[in-house]
């Protein structure tokens, strides 16, 4: 499968487990891959009684479930860890839960960045 219309070159990066895994906690991830593989962005999070706990964000390898998705939308009803993926640079900055079975759409905005 060739590269898609919205070619993904960079994604928002986040790792809640950064200390244990000895990675950066947050930033940008440049997506590197072969010409025959599409690349996407993803986000994963938990929802504990309405409190959103971000788990991971970054680049995601060629996945038909992510093709031509401009927004990061999780569709599983009530998973332990929510997951969404999308195509286009930084498309995982915001993420949404919209269950396929219907129900309220919930969009999670990133907190405003503190001035440096």
């Amino acid at each position: 499968s060739g590269r898609g219309e919205a070619e993904t070159r960079e994604c928002i990066y986040y790792n809640a487990n950064w200390e244990l895994e000895r990675t950066n906690q947050s930033g940008l991830e440049r997506c590197e891959g072969e010409q025959d593989k599409r690349l996407h962005c993803y986000a994963s999070w938990r929802n504990s009684s309405g409190t959103i706990e971000l788990v991971k964000k970054g680049c995601w390898l060629d996945d038909f479930n992510c093709y031509d998705r401009q927004e990061c939308v999780a569709t599983e009803e009530n998973p332990q860890v929510y997951f969404c993926c999308c195509e286009g640079n930084f498309c995982n900055e915001r993420f949404t839960h919209l269950p396929e079975a219907g129900g309220p759409e919930v969009t999670y905005e990133p907190p405003p960045t503190a001035p440096t």
């Epitope: 895994e21 000895r22 970054g58 860890v81």
Partner: antibody, heavy 119, light 108 residues
Framework: EVQLLESGGGLVQPGGSLRLSCAAS????????MTWVRQAPGKGLEWVSA????????YYADSVKGRFTISRDNSKNTLYLQMNSLRAEDTAVYYC????????????WGQGTLVTVSS | DIQMTQSPSSLSASVGDRVTITCRAS??????LNWYQQKPGKAPKLLIY???ILQTGVPSRFSGSGSGTDFTLTISSLQPEDFATYYC??????????FGGGTKVEIK
């Protein structure tokens, strides 16, 4: 075509050392994290060590921590595993593998090199 | 560490059979779950990544499903070349990956 070719295995006495190499070709080696996985005779797969694309981050299984050192030379497209203080339980086929982006599958593997630790 | 439990550890099947192998994680790994095939004396080969995505060149009779803690690898119609050992692997806790114990698929 992506290729990974391990070398350096052999018979070594307990307490001895070996250095494994993995020559990579067919892809931009410096863009990918790399991994060593081993398989004892008749057993399953065990992750041993990993190194980030630039070589700055290294990771080890508890069973080899302090004895094994992973490194890479991106100018030579080569991955290394220095194995010291070898034990009988380190006897295994050692595979190098390329790690792709999340969900981080090991998408290409070498053919493996056998390390036998015995007196 | 996340533990990966595969079942069954071995199974006997005939050519044309539908074969299902399960893998359970001790805690959620989201979709960070990969499947490998290994034939005797050969290196493992990636079959499926991200729980359900078929690696390039892998026949469509292989499929994967699941998310969170429970995953399945299915071979819809077993072929002679499919007799091998299959491993699941979680890649959620980077990079201290853990593999399942393996499932050996043998000829009945």
């Amino acid at each position: 075509e992506v290729q990974l070719l391990e070398s350096g295995g052999g018979l070594v006495q307990p307490g001895g050392s070996l250095r494994l190499s993995c020559a990579a070709s067919g892809f931009r080696f410096g863009n990918y994290a790399m991994t060593w996985v081993r398989q004892a005779p008749g057993k399953g797969l065990e992750w041993v060590s990993a190194i980030g694309a630039s070589g700055g981050s290294t990771y080890y299984a508890d069973s080899v921590k302090g004895r094994f050192t992973i490194s890479r030379d991106n100018s030579k497209n080569t991955l290394y595993l220095q194995m010291n203080s070898l034990r009988a339980e380190d006897t295994a086929v050692y595979y190098c593998a390329r790690e792709n982006v999340a969900p981080r599958p090991l998408d290409y593997w070498g053919q493996g090199t056998l390390v036998t630790v015995s007196s | 560490d996340i533990q990966m439990t595969q079942s069954p550890s071995s199974l006997s099947a005939s050519v044309g059979d539908r074969v299902t192998i399960t893998c359970r994680a001790s805690q959620s790994v989201s979709r960070f779950l990969n499947w490998y095939q290994q034939k005797p004396g050969k290196a493992p080969k990636l079959l499926i990544y991200g729980a359900s995505i078929l690696q390039t060149g892998v026949p469509s009779r292989f499929s994967g499903s699941g998310s969170g803690t429970d995953f399945t690898l299915t071979i819809s119609s077993l072929q002679p070349e499919d007799f091998a050992t299959y491993y699941c692997q979680q890649s959620y806790t980077t990079p201290t990956w853990t593999f399942g114990g393996g499932t050996k698929v043998e000829i009945k």
